[in-house]
């Protein structure tokens, strides 16, 4: 059985300020069981953007319905983009663990660039 891959097909996404950014991510397998999280940036200082397991993130909506048990599309939309949202976004698969889930595999990242709203 092939190991799960996290695929972020878009290396770059350009969005106008005030618009909605779509960041695409798919997993190639349902195994291992565990949530997806999205981060901006890498390393210890990365910023959590969306956590499938916990919380409500008002600016973020999922493209597909993650409550469906066979879902492997973890793409998100971020609304009302501002220049402060620019950065590289990573879709990260976690493996269910006890007491804490363990980071399993990350996508290659999508760099979000924001262009000023046309005046």
């Amino acid at each position: 059985e092939e190991e799960l891959q996290v695929i972020q097909p878009d290396k770059f996404v350009l969005v106008a300020a005030g618009e909605t950014a779509t960041l695409r991510c798919t997993a190639t397998s349902l195994i291992p069981v565990g949530p997806i999280q999205w981060f901006r940036g890498a390393g210890p200082g990365r910023e959590l953007i969306y956590n499938q397991k916990e919380g409500h993130f008002p600016r973020v909506t999922t493209v597909s319905d993650l409550t469906k048990r066979n879902n492997m599309d973890f793409s998100i939309r971020i609304g009302n983009i501002t220049p402060a949202d620019a950065g590289t976004y990573y879709c990260v698969k976690f493996r269910k663990g006890s007491p804490d889930d363990v980071e399993f595999k990350s996508g290659a990242g999508t760099e979000l660039s924001v262009r000023a709203k046309p005046s």
Epitope: G55, H56, L66, T67
Partner: antibody, heavy 120, light 107 residues
Framework: QVQLVESGGGVVQPGRSLRLSCAAS????????MIWVRQAPGKGLEWVAS????????YYADSVKGRFTISRDNSKNRLYLQMNSLRAEDTAVYYC?????????????WGQGTMVTVSS | DTQLTQSPSSLSASVGQRVTITCGAS??????MHWYQQKPGKQPKLLIY???NLEAGVPSRFSGSGSGTDFTLTISSLQPEDFATYYC?????????FGQGTKLEIK
């Protein structure tokens, strides 16, 4: 099998406090968000509070905000609802329920409920 | 807050009949609408999650449809054990809200 058993209900005077407990078994408690929902006699269901699996995210209904506190102890597989400054309108059956993963998931198992009566 | 309005509030029907209950949301909840059944003196039971997905162990005569603001629960052929109160519930955004319930009674 999945079991959720509420306890701690009873008759209490207005302004007093009560602590409800929900004992969970038959599943990995720490994987699930947990919810309190209440139902006043002869009325519909009202969501009261929810807590995420690691207690990082907590939400309350406006009607109980500042008076009720939801908490959990994953080492004991227990969910709690501390109810302070109780009012007559808090009289209801209180159910605990579980919710797998994130905010958008449904409540797939419920306890049998515990009755809270607020009366002088 | 997202208000949910169920229709009808009560309904009399016969065994074998097809029954439809609707739930309208005051704003879009995408597909994050769930349906529960509650019998007197019992806890609610999940029937349908995320608009159209049948929960494990629930008979296939129950089905759900809809997205956005309009949702439907259908029972294709009523059985005696289906007489109960049905609630819709949204989980698109906090606070979670429930419909006021639809009481299904035997005609």
């Amino acid at each position: 099998q999945v079991q959720l058993v509420e306890s701690g209900g009873g008759v209490v005077q207005p302004g007093r406090s009560l602590r409800l407990s929900c004992a969970a078994s038959g599943f990995t408690f720490s994987d699930y968000g947990m919810i309190w929902v209440r139902q006043a006699p002869g009325k519909g269901l009202e969501w009261v509070a929810s807590i995420s699996s690691s207690s990082s995210y907590i939400y309350y209904a406006d009607s109980v905000k500042g008076r009720f506190t939801i908490s959990r102890d994953n080492s004991k597989n227990r969910l709690y609802l501390q109810m302070n400054s109780l009012r007559a309108e808090d009289t209801a059956v209180y159910y605990c329920a579980r919710r797998y993963y994130g905010f958008n998931y449904p409540f797939d198992y419920w306890g049998q409920g515990t009755m809270v009566t607020v009366s002088s | 807050d997202t208000q949910l309005t169920q229709s009808p509030s009560s309904l009399s029907a016969s065994v074998g009949q097809r029954v439809t209950i609707t739930c309208g949301a005051s704003k879009s909840v995408r597909t994050y609408m769930h349906w529960y059944q509650q019998k007197p003196g019992k806890q609610p039971k999940l029937l349908i999650y995320s608009a159209s997905n049948l929960e494990a162990g629930v008979p296939s005569r129950f089905s759900g449809s809809g997205s956005g603001t309009d949702f439907t629960l259908t029972i294709s052929s009523l059985q005696p054990e289906d007489f109960a109160t049905y609630y819709c519930q949204q989980s698109n955004e906090p606070p979670y809200t429930f419909g006021q319930g639809t009481k299904l009674e035997i005609k």
